[in-house]
Each structure stands twice: as C-alpha cells, then as structure tokens.
Interface confidence: low
C-alpha cells in the first residue's frame, strides 16, 4: 500500500525547491526498481516528484490566500514490467498560512448618527475588519480593535469592533467627531499587522436648550392713531438647538392694561407685538409689558432643561398725534 504523511507547504517560501515529504509504496525495497509519477493540477509546474525516491518538492512560491490546497494523483510503476505497483491514489498538499495580510475594513467610509447627550454605553456603530489569513491557523486572523482617536467620548470593544459612547456630548459645543479605529491581528502580539479606518460620528440634536431672549429689555413705539391689530415691533429669542427643537412660541406674561398681544412668526421665529386695543397718548403714553418664550415641542424627558421660561421686559412709548 501507499505510505505518506499529511503534506504541508508553507506559503511564501523563497527557496527554489522546498521538500514537502515523501510518497512511497511499502513494496519499494529501495533498489530503484520503481518509478513514481505525479499527476494533476500543479504537477510538474508547482510540484515535482523524485521518480526514484518519491520525494515531493515545491518549486514555486505559493500563496495560501490564492490557493490553500492542491489535490494531486500519484502513480508507482514497476520499471521492469511497466505495470502499476499500486492503484493510482489521490492525495492533498495543504498550503499552510503565515501572517502576510493586514486587516482591512471593507465597508468604509463609516458614518453614524447618534443623539447628543446620549448616555454612556450607547451603541454608535460596529466596524468590522477582514483578514485574508487563515482564521484556523494560530492568531494570524484573530483581530483586536482599539481606538487611536476619539477619547474620551468613544470606546471600542476590543473583540467586536462595537463603538460606544463613553462620555456625554453636547451638539451645541461640537456637532461631529472623527474616530479612528485600528484593527490588529495576532491579537496584538509581536509581528502583528494592522489596518485603520475613520468613522465620522454626527450628533443629532435633542431639545436640551430653552429659547432665551436676545435682550432683557425691548423698547417699542406705537402711534396713538394706530388701529387695533397693528404690528408695533418684534422681539426675538435665540435657541441653540436646531430644527423643530428651536421652534418657539411667544406669549404675554404680564400686561395689566391688556392693550397688547404677542403672536409668533413661525417662519422667522420672532415674536410680533400686536396692538389689541387703541391707545391714547393723553391717557397713557408709556406701557410696560412682560413677554415669555417657550419651545413648541418639548418631550417629557427633556422638561428639566426647560424650567422657568425666559422673559423680557418691553417698554412701549405711545407717540402723540395732533388731534383736530
């Protein structure tokens, strides 16, 4: 019968001829009366056999990532008779892995959106690197992820590549962050290869800012000839939030005279002071009203940011008109 061990050849061997092993018949007594032959893909070009001894050699540099095993056939012939000594047999040469491939992030560019003020531990995104080396061969393809840039706001789970928030962030201070993740094979041991990727993390807005009046005191004038419904001026608050989180509603907090009203221009987010009833310079030529401003939409969990609406004082001077 045939006698051989499992055949392995390391990839990327630079020698012109590398002995892999021996293939022989147990009928071979070593007197050179048998001839060994190699057949199949790679026979003669990649692998050769010593016809007399059955020793097999690799004569080309191999790349496991291109081809990890070769299936060949062996024959042994009695030189005297020309007959097969053993039935033709199939055997396998496995290309063994070396760590010659760095981890690669295949899905980049990575981009994620996470709400500002998200608590620690909130999942942002998972990044995954691939390593073309053999995952079953030692640690060549065993990866560890680490954060090169993004502390203290982000952390990465070393074995999964899951990025999480590690510190609360305020969109109003910074609305996006670039995080750089490194993947290292050989679980970080010497000889490890690495690859990096960038992740753009954008913070989406939450309503964590209340509107605040630009001025603590506004001064407006109204002619005593102005009809009711006249817009006599505008007041404005600012809100550091964006979009619907910055939409606001103005209202009168205090107007003992009940002479004025405030409506909200939802396009400009301004408060428009409206004359509700006619004024008379001779009766009163100066009014003070207090206005307040609140956000339009405030989720229950964010009410803590919206206690005590911002207020402003509006001094309104009535302009005299000569009466006939």
């Amino acid at each position: 019968g045939w006698v051989w061990n499992q055949f392995f050849v390391p990839e990327e061997m630079n020698t012109t001829s590398h002995h892999i092993g021996q293939l022989r018949s147990d009928l071979d007594n070593g007197n050179n009366s048998f001839q060994y032959k190699l057949l199949g893909a790679g026979a003669g070009s990649t692998f050769i056999i010593d016809e007399r001894t059955g020793d097999i050699y690799a004569i080309q540099k191999l790349d496991r990532e291109e081809r990890s095993l070769y299936i060949l056939r062996a024959q042994v012939i009695d030189i005297a008779t020309g007959r097969a000594v053993e039935p033709e047999s199939e055997f396998v040469i496995k290309v063994s892995d070396i760590n010659d491939n760095e981890p690669k992030f295949l899905d980049e560019p990575y981009e994620a959106i996470v709400p500002e003020m998200s608590p620690e531990g909130t999942l942002v995104i998972q990044v995954t690197a691939s390593d073309a080396d053999d995952p079953s061969s030692g640690n060549n393809a065993r990866l560890l992820y680490s954060l090169l840039q993004g502390q203290p706001y982000f952390s990465v789970e070393p074995t999964t590549g899951v990025i999480r928030i590690s510190s609360k962030m305020d969109r109003e201070l910074q609305d996006e962050y670039w995080v750089i993740i490194q993947a290292k094979d050989m679980i970080g041991q010497p000889g490890a290869l690495s690859g990096t990727t960038s992740v753009l993390i954008k913070l989406s807005d939450v309503n964590d800012n209340k509107p605040i009046f630009k001025e603590s005191l506004y001064r407006l004038t109204v002619s005593e000839s102005a009809p009711t419904g006249t817009s006599i001026g505008t007041i404005m608050a600012y809100d550091n939030d964006i979009g619907e989180n910055a939409e606001m509603d103005y209202s009168i907090e205090e107007d003992d005279s009940q002479t004025f009203d405030i409506i909200t221009n939802h396009e400009t987010q301004e408060g428009i002071v409206i004359l509700k009833k006619k004024v008379d310079f001779e009766h009163q030529n100066h009014y003070g009203i207090r206005a307040k401003v609140k956000n339009h939409h405030v989720p229950e969990q964010l009410m803590k940011y919206h206690t005590e609406a911002s207020t402003t004082f509006i001094k309104i001077q009535v302009e005299d008109v000569d009466e006939p």
């Epitope: 005191l217 001064r219 003070g288 004082f313 001077q317």
Partner: antibody, heavy 119, light 107 residues
Framework: QVQLVESGGGVVQPGRSLRLSCAAS????????MHWVRQAPGKGLEWVAV????????YYADSVKGRFTISRDTSKNTLYLQMNSLRAEDTAVYYC????????????WGQGTLVSVSS | EIVLTQSPGTLSLSPGERATLSCRAS???????LAWYHQRPGQAPRLLIY???SRAAGIPDRFSGSGSGTDFTLTISRLEPEDFAVYYC????????FGQGTKVEIK
C-alpha cells in the same frame, strides 16, 4: 421732591470690591427703571448699568459686564452697585439716575460718589 | 453700539450770544431717542431735552433741540451766565451712550 443720594465710594485697591448705594425718595421707587452712570476724572459720561422697575431685568455696559452687579431693594427704596475685580480704569464719580417713566432719558441724578481704584 | 460725536469740543461765547451745539450719531437714532444734558463743574448732569426736541420740566425756553436720524442740534438762543457748562448728548435708541461733551465757556 425727587432725591437720589449716593454713598459707599472711597479708595480701594485693584482687584478688590466695593458696594455703592443710592437712597431714593420723593417718588414711587418701584415704578421706575434705575441706572448707574460714571464719569472718570476730567472725562465724559459713561453709562454703566440699568435695572428694571421690578428688579427682574438688568443690563450692563460691556466694560463692566461680569464684574458689576446692579440690584435694588424696593422695601428700602435703595439702588445698589456691587463692584468686584475693580480696575484702575473704574476710577470715577458714580451717579445713580432715574429713567423717565414716559421715556428712556434720565430725569433725575444723584450728586455722585467718588470711587478711586489705586494701589 | 451707537457712537455719538459732539462738535465743537469747546465753544467760546459771550453772555447773550446764541450757542449751537451739534451731535452726530454713527447710525440712525430711531424715534428721535436723543437727549441733551448740561453739567456745571462739581455738579451732577441735568436733563434739558429728551426726544430730540422736548424740553424737560423746569427748563427755560431758550433751550431748544432739533434733528432726527443721525444729526441733532441743541440751540441756546441767549446765553445766561449759568449756561456756561459742559453739554452732553445721549442716545437711548439702542442701550445708552453719551457724546464726549462740548464745553461752553465764557469768551
């Protein structure tokens, strides 16, 4: 008649604090916005701060923002100016002034109190 | 802020003469929110004119104010001895600022 009397001025070292008072009489103090205005020696007038009639709103000149605090005690008919982190350039006569009820000009002024910031 | 520039810096006149003081604003003073004060040596300022042209209570009619937008004038028709003082304009259209003053002195 309307009277405004300032007090609390004096010589103070840079970085120190001082509180000025202005006692008001002869009018309904709680109905008027009140101001502090200063005048450096030989110089012009500089508006410093205003407080609304009810004390809920204050407004400051940029030169004193964050260092000075205007306040009022309606029960005592008194206006105050708390001056912290004083600098040499704060040296001046400090006047309290009443804002006209129907306007925003200053119709009554106190006689002033001198604050001298010097080491 | 609105900057007020007064001219001239000093006005040398005799009693009985007419004094014309100018105040120019760096931007339009809305609704003629401009006042004039005078200050005698060692005294507090005193309101003369508010709203650019309205005389304050107790102010003699020799004092008159005019102007709008960026140019304002205080006129003293006949100078009395007590009128020799420093005059300040003040805008209250946007916060409060004063001009640097015009000194009216006896010639």
């Amino acid at each position: 008649q309307v009277q405004l009397v300032e007090s609390g001025g004096g010589v103070v070292q840079p970085g120190r604090s001082l509180r000025l008072s202005c006692a008001a009489s002869g009018f309904t103090f709680s109905s008027y916005d009140m101001h502090w205005v200063r005048q450096a020696p030989g110089k012009g007038l500089e508006w410093v701060a205003v407080i609304s009639y009810d004390g809920t709103n204050e407004y400051y000149a940029d030169s004193v923002k964050g260092r000075f605090t205007i306040s009022r005690d309606t029960s005592k008919n008194t206006l105050y100016l708390q001056m912290n982190s004083l600098r040499a350039e704060d040296t001046a006569v400090y006047y309290c002034a009443r804002e006209r009820y129907f306007d925003w000009s200053f119709d009554y002024w106190g006689q002033g109190t001198l604050v001298s910031v010097s080491s | 802020e609105i900057v007020l520039t007064q001219s001239p810096g000093t006005l040398s006149l005799s009693p009985g003469e007419r004094a014309t003081l100018s105040c120019r604003a760096s931007q339009s003073v809305s609704n003629t929110y401009l006042a004039w004060y005078h200050q005698r040596p060692g005294q507090a300022p005193r309101l003369l004119i508010y709203g650019a042209s309205s005389r304050a209570a107790g102010i003699p009619d020799r004092f008159s104010g005019s102007g709008s937008g960026t140019d304002f004038t205080l006129t003293i028709s006949r100078l009395e001895p007590e009128d020799f003082a420093v005059y300040y304009c003040q805008q209250y259209s946007n916060s409060w600022t004063f001009g640097q003053g015009t000194k009216v002195e006896i010639k």
